[in-house]
């Protein structure tokens, strides 16, 4: 299996909410002996390998943000801890999984990584990751809503309809 990142760059104004997304591609074994561990973390573009270093997202580690289930089952992170930090990670039945960040600040800018570990009984683990950049902007140059840039082409897409301002 592989992990696809539909968008490689998210450009958002301060105060906006954004959902970063990864997608599990390829044959996904739904057998009892296969489970998937999915999580999110911040990283840096290393000289050797992107997403090698695991840094917290808003003080929450990859351990705090993980999802754990079999095949294409849906799952959510433990709400209380994540939501106190304006975060929620989720997974659906179609291989999509995401992290939603609320009320963005400039400090949220950086490289974000999704990680999937396939755990197959009596086999070595199979690890894959995806990377995407989040740029949070302020001032007159900032977009009014999040703009996303697809990984495969330069076409941008306004995602106003899906992401609304955080209301206090």
């Amino acid at each position: 299996f592989k992990v696809a990142t539909p968008y490689s760059l998210y450009v958002c104004p301060e105060g906006q909410n954004v959902t970063l997304t990864c997608r599990l591609l390829g044959p996904v074994d739904k057998g009892h002996d296969v489970t998937f561990y999915k999580t999110w973390y911040r990283s840096s573009r290393g000289e050797v390998q992107t997403c090698s270093e695991r840094r917290p997202i808003r003080n929450l580690t990859f351990q705090d943000l993980h999802l754990h289930h079999g095949g294409h089952q849906a799952a959510n992170t433990s709400h209380d801890l994540a939501q106190r930090h304006g975060l929620e990670s989720a997974s659906d039945h179609h291989g999509n999984f995401s992290i939603t960040m609320r009320n963005l600040t400039l400090l949220d800018s950086g490289l974000y990584c999704c990680l999937v570990v396939e755990i197959r009984h009596h086999h070595s683990e199979h690890r894959v990751h995806g990377a995407m950049e989040l740029q949070v902007q302020t001032g007159k140059d900032a977009p009014s809503n999040c703009v996303v840039y697809p990984s495969s082409s330069q076409e941008s897409e306004n995602i106003t309809a899906h992401h609304h301002h955080h209301h206090h």
Partner: antibody, heavy 118, light 107 residues
Framework: QVQLVESGGGLVKPGGSLRLSCAAS????????MSWIRQAPGKGLEWVSY????????YYADSVKGRFTISRDNAKNSLYLQMNSLRAEDTAVYYC???????????WGRGTLVTVSS | EIVLTQSPATLSLSPGERATLSCRAS??????LAWYQQKPGQAPRLLIY???NRATGIPARFSASGSGTDFTLTISSLEPEDFAVYYC?????????FGQGTKVEIK
């Protein structure tokens, strides 16, 4: 605080049995896979057994397969190692350690000493 | 089973000196290798994960590199608290295996 505390070690005769416990606190135990790792006196580290957060799958080192049984009780935040048919070569400090898929042993207990001797 | 061979077995150095420790795998472990530090009477502590990344709270004087079968841990300038035993460990295959350790002692 975040910690693991082992107990249940002691002196036992060859062929005897012992049950080790590991009490977890300060983190969501049911989220984590766990392992037992041992260290014979003056020697290196040897991984013994592994259990997933849900209790399955389970793995054992060949040296203990069929004699040791790992288990957990998430409601009690506890990990166990039932050791039967003990041998002199099982003498070691036994550590429980926190594990996760695609990760490493990032939290260890202080260990409990098991001595197998007649 | 993947065998990890560490060298040297013992390294005798003075504080302030540079320490270079080696770990060689009997077959490729990709970058799925960690380094641990263990002091007498204590449990091991995770220093490096995925061959080259410092774990939380580990000082910058510790660095590591390698992939496949050859790995190196470097302590740029030894502090008194760095004298300990260092183990490498792989998680690319079952069973999880450790190297036999390198003892860094005061000269």
């Amino acid at each position: 605080q975040v910690q693991l505390v082992e107990s249940g070690g002691g002196l036992v005769k060859p062929g005897g049995s012992l049950r080790l416990s590991c009490a977890a606190s300060g983190f969501t135990f049911s989220d984590y896979y766990m392992s037992w790792i041992r260290q014979a006196p003056g020697k290196g580290l040897e991984w013994v057994s592994y259990i997933s957060n849900s209790g399955s799958p389970i793995y054992y080192a060949d040296s203990v397969k069929g004699r040791f049984t790992i288990s957990r009780d998430n409601a009690k935040n506890s990990l166990y190692l039932q050791m039967n048919s003990l041998r002199a070569e099982d003498t070691a400090v036994y550590y429980c350690a926190r594990d996760l898929p695609g990760w490493y042993f990032d939290l260890w207990g202080r260990g409990t000493l098991v001595t197998v001797s007649s | 089973e993947i065998v990890l061979t560490q060298s040297p077995a013992t390294l005798s150095l003075s504080p302030g000196e540079r320490a270079t420790l080696s770990c060689r795998a009997s077959q490729s472990v990709s970058s799925y290798l960690a380094w641990y530090q263990q002091k007498p009477g204590q449990a091991p502590r995770l220093l490096i994960y995925d061959a080259s990344n410092r774990a939380t709270g580990i000082p910058a004087r510790f660095s590591a590199s390698g992939s496949g079968t050859d790995f190196t841990l470097t302590i740029s300038s030894l502090e008194p608290e760095d004298f300990a035993v260092y183990y490498c460990q792989q998680r690319n295959n079952w069973p999880r295996t450790f190297g036999q350790g390198t003892k860094v002692e005061i000269k």
